[in-house]
């Protein structure tokens, strides 16, 4: 039993589960939104799809003091293979194009649902 005990220990979360949890978090944010999300802060829009998780994190990491998206930021960091810090600017972003955080989160939710349906979990 001691040897078998290892099988019960929590291992890495499967990508499909992590994506589903991220989608659920974004659903919570969009459904529970009363006042303007993050005081109407603006973030960079994203124009491409490869490397999207890192680009999304790069956009949202620049929003500080917004507890509503802190969990989303943490979850996105799990999908991004490199360290992301505020001020980074990816080629994936549409330069000079910013949108409201609420719209970004809503759009991200739409996109992640598509990826989930298509079986693209990473």
């Amino acid at each position: 039993l001691t040897c078998l005990g290892g099988f019960a220990s929590p291992g890495p979360v499967p990508p499909s589960t992590a994506l589903r949890e991220l989608i659920e978090e974004l659903v919570n944010i969009t459904q529970n939104q009363k006042a303007p999300l993050c005081n109407g802060s603006m973030v960079w829009s994203i124009n491409l799809t490869a490397g999207m998780y890192c680009a999304a994190l790069e956009s949202l990491i620049n929003v500080s003091g917004c507890s509503a998206i802190e969990k989303t930021q943490r979850m996105l960091s799990g999908f991004c293979p490199h360290k992301v810090s505020a001020g980074q600017f990816s080629s994936l972003h549409v330069r000079d194009t910013k949108i409201e955080v609420a719209q970004f989160v809503k759009d991200l939710l739409l996109h992640l649902k598509k990826l989930f349906r298509e079986g693209q979990f990473n």
């Epitope: 829009s45 994203i46 809503k106």
Partner: nanobody
Framework: GVQLLESGGGLVQPGGSLRLSCAAS????????MGWVRQAPGKGLEWVSS????????YYADSVKGRFTISRDNSKNTLYLQMNSLRAEDTAVYYC???????????WGQGTLVTVSS
């Protein structure tokens, strides 16, 4: 907020060509399926064409198949409709719109008028 701004409409002779553009702003254009819808004078809305978010899948109404080509440039947040071999029956206001099944993701432009007449 969200904006879709069509341009490129105008008067053209039968058999001529036009290229419509739709500049998107205020939302994550690259993640949306997009489309074109038209409304002829005194008629209802008619779906013309749509394209998936990747740009790899395109769909056309039978009435425009082989004459119209939809495309997109996600780096420019722009949707296009190349219209060739235009006919009088293509005369309409052409609207750019998102093409999503999900409720709450429905955005439309103001439209651009295309008139095909000699």
């Amino acid at each position: 907020g969200v904006q879709l701004l069509e341009s490129g409409g105008g008067l053209v002779q039968p058999g001529g060509s036009l290229r419509l553009s739709c500049a998107a702003s205020g939302f994550s254009f690259a993640w949306y399926d997009m489309g074109w819808v038209r409304q002829a004078p005194g008629k209802g809305l008619e779906w013309v064409s749509s394209i998936d978010w990747k740009g790899g899948k395109t769909y056309y109404a039978d009435s425009v198949k082989g004459r119209f080509t939809i495309s997109r440039d996600n780096s420019k947040n722009t949707l296009y409709l190349q219209m060739n071999s235009l006919r009088a029956e293509d005369t309409a206001v052409y609207y750019c719109a998102t093409a999503e099944d999900e409720p709450g993701y429905d955005y439309w432009g103001q439209g651009t008028l295309v008139t095909v007449s000699s």
